[in-house]
């Protein structure tokens, strides 16, 4: 499963879109959890709202929320207020019992903000705009290939 | 009528080739993921693996990962078991069965609607 | 793998009788489990999904019951077309195993 790179300003927030097959994942809940090293666990962030239905409402943790058009197939994920310690390596998790199964792994990268650098010169931030779509540097070419289902007893 | 058709009975011997099939109707085959069950002659029922049409994710249990192959072509909404080698342990009936969907607030589906089963004897 | 253990492994009851059949597994699987019934030369049937919900067309003397390790299959009054054997099947982790099996037989 390729990564995706996704780079967002400090003090702003980023959004992170996650598409999945409807069908395939339905009824299931979905999670963002951030992975503690290469070959570490994925620790969880936030999840979906525990009854399925209502997974359209979004969910909470800190700074970051969680919500999932069940129908659309696309889970979005906010990281508000990015700051330096959010940048590291994500994944979005479709849930189903005990098994995680891994939709899209994303890697996060805190851009300073050019406005706090002397030499920032005229680069020019939109001033209306305190969310960011992140700069997809790479996108990935199976995002809805599942490597990581299920952990086995 | 929703449906799983499988294949008729098999008489093979040990070493050879086999490949049954499964073919879904009455639904979109696509969407539901389909699964295997083995059951030997007067013995229970063991789970051996699922597959999804829509894109061929499979999920093997380890006691037959590596014995057999799970497919499907959705063009002709068909899943598949086969063998490369059989043996004399793999004389069973093999159902073919449909994971249901959703429906409450734990996704435990079940498996709602189940081929007639198809009889396969190894033997020398 | 989990382990799923049914008890008993037989049982003899007639007709109008309260049957109940158990259900065991070896880790705490929430309410991921299903019960089939399978009578001989035939496919197995769903009664029970999600450990207590009624599969559309059952009747309704079938009920399940239970959460995380222990759950119960109960026929209220047993009817002649019930005598058959009996499968619980875990869904929470692959592989979704089955139990033994009850078989329930005409006393």
């Known amino acids: 499963l390729n990564t995706t790179v996704l780079q967002g300003m400090a003090g702003q927030s980023l959004r992170v879109s996650c598409t999945y097959d409807a069908l395939k994942h339905w009824g299931r809940r979905k999670a963002w959890c951030r992975q503690l090293g290469e070959e570490g666990p994925c620790q969880r962030v936030v999840s979906t709202h525990g009854v399925w239905l209502l997974a359209f409402l979004k969910k909470r943790n800190g700074s970051t929320v969680i919500a999932d058009d069940t129908l659309a197939g696309t889970v979005t994920i906010t990281l508000k207020n990015l700051q330096a310690g959010d940048a590291g390596l994500y994944q979005c998790q479709s849930l189903r019992g005990r098994e995680a199964e891994v939709l899209q792994k994303v890697l996060v990268e805190v851009l300073e903000d050019p406005l706090d650098d002397q030499d920032a010169g005229d680069l020019w931030v939109p001033e209306e705009s305190s969310s960011f779509e992140g700069a997809q540097v790479e996108h990935s070419t199976s995002r809805n290939q599942e490597t990581s289902f299920p952990p086995t007893s | 009528e929703v449906q799983l058709v499988q294949s008729g009975a098999e008489v093979k011997k040990p070493g050879e080739s086999l490949k049954i099939s499964c073919k879904g109707s009455?639904?979109?085959?696509?969407?539901?993921?389909i699964g295997w069950v083995r059951q030997m002659p007067g013995k229970g029922l063991e789970w051996m693996g699922i597959?999804?049409?829509?894109?061929?994710?499979?999920r093997y249990s380890p006691s037959f990962q590596g014995q057999v192959t799970i497919s499907a072509d959705k063009s002709i909404s068909t899943a598949y078991l086969q063998w490369s080698s059989l043996k004399a342990s793999d004389t069973a009936m093999y159902y073919c069965?449909?994971?249901?969907?959703?429906?409450?607030?734990?996704?435990?589906?079940?498996?709602?609607?189940w081929g007639q089963g198809t009889t396969v004897t190894v033997s020398s | 793998d989990i382990q799923m253990t049914q008890s008993p492994s037989s049982l003899s009851a007639s007709v109008g009788d309260r049957v109940t059949i158990t259900c065991r597994a070896s880790?705490?699987?929430?309410?991921?489990l299903n019960w089939y019934q399978q009578k001989p030369g035939k496919a197995p049937k769903l009664l029970i999904y999600?450990?207590?919900s009624l599969q559309s067309g059952v009747p309704s003397r079938f009920s399940g019951s239970g959460s995380g390790t222990d759950f119960t299959l109960t026929i209220s009054s047993l009817q002649p077309e019930d005598f058959a054997t009996y499968y619980c099947?875990?869904?929470?982790?692959?592989?979704?195993?089955f139990g033994g099996g009850t078989k329930v037989e005409i006393k």
């Open positions: 069965a449909r994971l249901g969907h959703y429906s409450g607030t734990v996704s435990s589906y079940g498996m709602d609607v």
């Open positions: 999600a450990a207590s």
């Open positions: 009455g639904y979109s085959f696509t969407s539901y993921w």
């Open positions: 880790q705490s699987i929430s309410s991921y």
């Open positions: 597959i999804y049409p829509g894109d061929s994710d499979t």
């Open positions: 099947q875990q869904e929470y982790a692959v592989p979704y195993t």
